[in-house]
């Protein structure tokens, strides 16, 4: 049996809402809106699976489908990282990986996807309807986030397939991806929308297949374009909160990334750029890549296996890659 985490079905406005504007005039803003929202936008997918061999452990997989290069991945649970979620792991392609209990193994699967295994026992263990979110910071697309959860009815060993239209928050939908034509179209669209703002907004219909489907602050031009139109943000109800949430410091960050260099619109310096950077004792992680990344939450330091701080004498480079945490 496969279960699926659903995103609300976004309905187009009712035909009666067209009013005096006319069908032809109304179609143009919808087309422009679709272009503005989807042009050059990548996609993030999230999978959550309860392992059949270890019924108390979860595997979370996240991937970025875009042509850009990933510069940071943040995995959180209980909601998006900047909205009450608690950071489970932060993965950086050069500085390595840091994870917090109950995360057992965070690793790069590929250059654009990661996986995280969660321990299921103990007070901080996840439960079946916990929401897990992955945020990818990439160049040049910007920062993208998607969330997913495994419904309580899921069979062990099966995963909830990624939602057809992932729950996404675009901090910047393509730094370099919007052409002048599209920009003009978007401005024109805004002009049209302002001109006709007295019209009632289209209704949002909750998904018929998911009684607990969240309400999304977005609307789509048509059912046909749903697959391409990304919902900017949605909150998922979860009845299970991590036990360690109260101990989190939402405004702090991984202390060993306190002094990440800022680099605007270019790929990182050579492979040795941060190889010898000492790991600071404390500090606040300030996002790089033109300030696109949200801060990653930090908990009090752990000395157990949940904390990974480059034991390899060759530094963080030895920790990187699909091998993940040694």
């Amino acid at each position: 049996m496969r279960t699926e985490a659903q995103v609300p079905a976004l309905q187009p406005p009712e035909p009666g809402l067209e009013g005096a504007m006319g069908h032809r005039t109304l179609v143009l803003p919808w087309v422009l809106l679709t272009l503005c929202v989807t042009a050059g936008t990548p996609e993030v997918w999230v999978q959550v699976r309860m392992e059949a061999t270890e019924l108390s452990s979860f595997t979370i997989r996240c991937g970025f489908l875009g042509s850009g290069s990933i510069s940071l991945v943040t995995v959180s649970w209980g909601g998006p990282n900047g909205a009450g979620g608690t950071t489970l792991a932060v993965l950086h392609p050069e500085r390595g990986i840091r994870q917090w209990a109950p995360a057992r193994q965070a690793r790069w699967e590929t250059q654009s996807s990661i996986s995280l295994i969660l321990e299921g026992s103990g007070a901080s263990s996840p439960c079946a309807n916990t929401t897990f979110c992955c945020k990818f910071a990439s160049f040049p697309e910007g920062s993208w986030e998607a969330c997913g959860s495994l419904p309580p009815s899921s069979d062990p060993g099966l995963s909830a397939p990624p939602t057809p239209a992932p729950i996404l928050r675009a901090d910047l939908a393509g730094i370099l991806g919007v052409s002048g034509v599209l920009l003009f179209g978007c401005v024109y669209l805004l002009h049209l929308l302002r001109r006709h703002k007295h019209r009632p907004a289209p209704r949002l219909q909750p998904s018929r297949t998911s009684p607990q489907a969240p309400r999304a602050r977005a609307w789509a031009p048509s059912q046909a374009s749903q697959a391409a139109l990304h919902v900017p943000y949605a909150t998922i109800n979860t009845s299970c909160r991590p036990a360690t949430l109260d101990t989190a410091h939402p405004h702090g960050g991984p202390s060993w990334w306190a002094s990440l260099p800022t680099h605007a619109a270019h790929r990182p310096q050579g492979p040795a750029a941060w190889a010898s950077t000492p790991i600071p004792a404390r500090g606040s992680f300030v996002s790089v890549e033109n300030g696109l990344y949200a801060q990653a939450g930090e908990r009090p330091p752990h000395t157990g296996p949940g904390l990974t701080l480059f034991p390899d004498p060759r530094g963080p480079r030895a920790m990187e890659g699909p091998l993940g945490v040694r």
């Epitope: 991937g63 990933i70 492979p271």
Partner: antibody
Framework: QIQLVQSGPDLKKPGETVKISCKAS????????MSWVKQAPGRGLKWMGW????????TFPDDFKGRFAFSLETSASTAYLQINNLKNEDSATYFC????????????????WGTGTTVTVSS | DIVLTQSPAIMSASPGEKVTMTCSAS???SSWYLHWYQQKSGASPK???????NLASGVPARFSGSGSGTSYSLTISSVEAEDAATYYC?????????FGSGTKLEIK
């Protein structure tokens, strides 16, 4: 058309150094990791590690730490494998292999393979 | 390291026969991370099946893959002469990536 074209065969003496190139075409080079795989004559495949083509960071399994190095010439969409202080047991065919993007159906596979470079180490 | 054991090491089949080869892992491998490659003599390997059961581009539909946990298999429903090759399984459940020793398929 996506392809990985490797440099030609090489004959070396023990103690020398060999550098194999792998030129990628048909895709965005810095989006996919590049792995290297060794196949000794009549033997199976052995993974040598991979390099992140965006960050330039290399990862090696224990068996290939020390004498082996990966490098990049991003502007030429080319990856390199260098083996220092060659030994007889390094005689093999070496493949570069693109690390697949990863998807909801799988990850950690090599979706495009290079043409292979045979290195013979003999005194 | 996870050790992958392939059996049989060599097998032969006549055109039209159904063929199954297996790959046994020393510890559990998630289906996401189990893949198969085909390598013909003197050629580079090719991705054949990824994520246990997904056929790579251009692979004939007579091939299929299945399995879970520590036991996986590749099946050819009706073998053809062009299928003669060595087939390797590969895992990436835990580091490092490892390959099986291969099953060589000969066509009678």
């Amino acid at each position: 058309q996506i392809q990985l074209v490797q440099s030609g065969p090489d004959l070396k003496k023990p103690g020398e150094t060999v550098k194999i190139s792998c030129k990628a075409s048909g895709y965005t080079f810095t989006t996919y990791g590049m792995s290297w795989v060794k196949q000794a004559p009549g033997r199976g495949l052995k993974w040598m590690g991979w390099i992140n083509t965006y960050s330039g960071v290399s990862t090696f399994p224990d068996d290939f730490k020390g004498r082996f190095a990966f490098s990049l010439e991003t502007s030429a969409s080319t990856a390199y494998l260098q083996i220092n202080n060659l030994k007889n047991e390094d005689s093999a065919t070496y493949f570069c292999a693109r690390l697949g993007m990863g998807s909801t159906t799988g990850a950690g596979y090599f979706d495009v393979w290079g043409t292979g470079t045979t290195v013979t180490v003999s005194s | 390291d996870i050790v992958l054991t392939q059996s049989p090491a060599i097998m032969s089949a006549s055109p039209g026969e159904k063929v199954t080869m297996t790959c046994s892992a020393s510890s559990s491998v998630s289906s996401w991370y189990l893949h198969w490659y085909q390598q013909k003599s003197g050629a580079s390997p090719k991705l054949w099946i990824y994520g246990t059961s997904n056929l790579a581009s251009g692979v004939p539909a007579r091939f299929s893959g299945s399995g879970s946990g520590t036991s996986y298999s590749l099946t050819i429903s009706s073998v053809e002469a062009e299928d003669a090759a060595t087939y390797y399984c590969q895992q990436y459940r835990s580091d490092p990536y490892t390959f099986g020793s291969g099953t060589k398929l000969e066509i009678k």
